[in-house]
Interface confidence: medium
Amino acid sequence: HNTTVFQGVAGQSLQVSCPYDSMKHWGRRKAWCRQLGEKGPCQRVVSTHNLWLLSFLRRWNGSTAITDDTLGGTLTITLRNLQPHDAGLYQCQSLHGSEADTLRKVLVEVLADPLDHRDAGDLWFPGESESFEDAHVEHSISRSLLEGEIPFPPTS
């Protein structure tokens, strides 16, 4: 799976979309999880309604919401009041019993609020590498992470 980058501004909302084949994933619940380290597990943040037919209903866990358009084949995650600590690697998943298939790998970048004059030193996002000129743009605030780019911040 390629990684798609979604950028959001601190304090604002960020909407992440994960398209999928609606016929292939018929009847499957979906989830949004956060990758813990490059090879670590993906920790569940929020999942769609327990009743698959009610997947369109928005479910919240803290400041993160999930809703599934099962007909159109689009899982949408909303991160409200984006904070620096929200930056990192996530996955959209299709659930099957105790197993999960990755629909999309997502890198969330948190940008400093241009109207906020406080020190932005605690905001992390990967530096723009020379390989981004061919990146696929999902919408104005997302792009695909190309091979060779590091999705995790360097550990000190």
């Epitope: 609606s22 016929m23 292939k24 018929w26 009847g27």
Partner: antibody
Framework: EVQLVESGGGLVQPGRSLKLSCAAS????????MAWVRQAPKKGLEWVAT????????YYRDSVKGRFTISRDNAKSTLYLQMDSLRSEDTATYYC??????????WGQGASVTVSS | DIQMTQTPSSMPASLGERVTISCRAS??????LNWYQQKPDGTIKPLIY???NLQSGVPSRFSGSGSGTDYSLTISSLEPEDFAMYYC?????????FGGGTKLEIK
């Protein structure tokens, strides 16, 4: 118990039309995805079409696209396959199937369609 | 379209024997593979879904495994009612496609 009963099969000339029906019972039809799968004589199975909710969410194999229409009547718990401009290669037993999570959970007994002049 | 190749096309076997039917996809299908049984009277029923999950009501002598492009169905000890046609089916991408079938015959 889930039951799927196909009807409407028969002998038809090339270029003509035929409509298959599949009466469903034993489950909530309106909440279910349904499919048609066919099997030519002495051949393997071939997926034909799937309907998820209604006619806005239908899928077809390329060879029947534009000629076949899958539809449903939730009030009657019935699935349909309208087959137009029939060809000899459409000769097959047509099975109606209930599409569950990942797998076609239940199948009908099949309706035989022969396209010949 | 993804081509599904089943081997063997026919298999003579004895009661109590362990048999394995193979299915190869023309490209990786990420475990999106099902197995179906078709009896001589035309009755079709699902056995295994998503590579290795036993369909409700199916005896535990049936099992499935595989990954990538190569998958298999194993019957640990053949019973009289197991002599039938077996089909694999991928649903990784549309159109869904089936293997050509394996006829399990009494030796």
């Amino acid at each position: 118990e889930v039951q799927l009963v196909e009807s409407g099969g028969g002998l038809v000339q090339p270029g003509r039309s035929l409509k298959l029906s599949c009466a469903a019972s034993g489950f909530t039809f309106s909440d279910s995805a349904m499919a048609w799968v066919r099997q030519a004589p002495k051949k393997g199975l071939e997926w034909v079409a799937t309907i998820i909710y209604d006619t806005s969410s239908t899928y077809y194999r390329d060879s029947v696209k534009g000629r076949f229409t899958i539809s449903r009547d939730n009030a009657k718990s019935t699935l349909y396959l309208q087959m137009d401009s029939l060809r000899s290669e459409d000769t097959a037993t047509y099975y109606c199937a209930l599409f569950g999570v990942d797998v076609m959970d239940a199948w009908g007994q099949g309706a035989s369609v022969t396209v010949s002049s | 379209d993804i081509q599904m190749t089943q081997t063997p096309s026919s298999m003579p076997a004895s009661l109590g024997e362990r048999v394995t039917i193979s299915c190869r996809a023309s490209q990786g299908i990420s475990n999106y593979l099902n197995w179906y049984q078709q009896k001589p009277d035309g009755t079709i029923k699902p056995l295994i879904y998503y590579t290795s999950n036993l369909q409700s009501g199916v005896p535990s002598r049936f099992s499935g495994s595989g990954s990538g492009t190569d998958y298999s169905l194993t019957i640990s000890s053949l019973e009289p009612e197991d002599f039938a046609m077996y089909y694999c089916q991928q649903y990784d991408s549309s159109p869904w496609t089936f293997g050509g079938g394996t006829k399990l015959e009494i030796k």
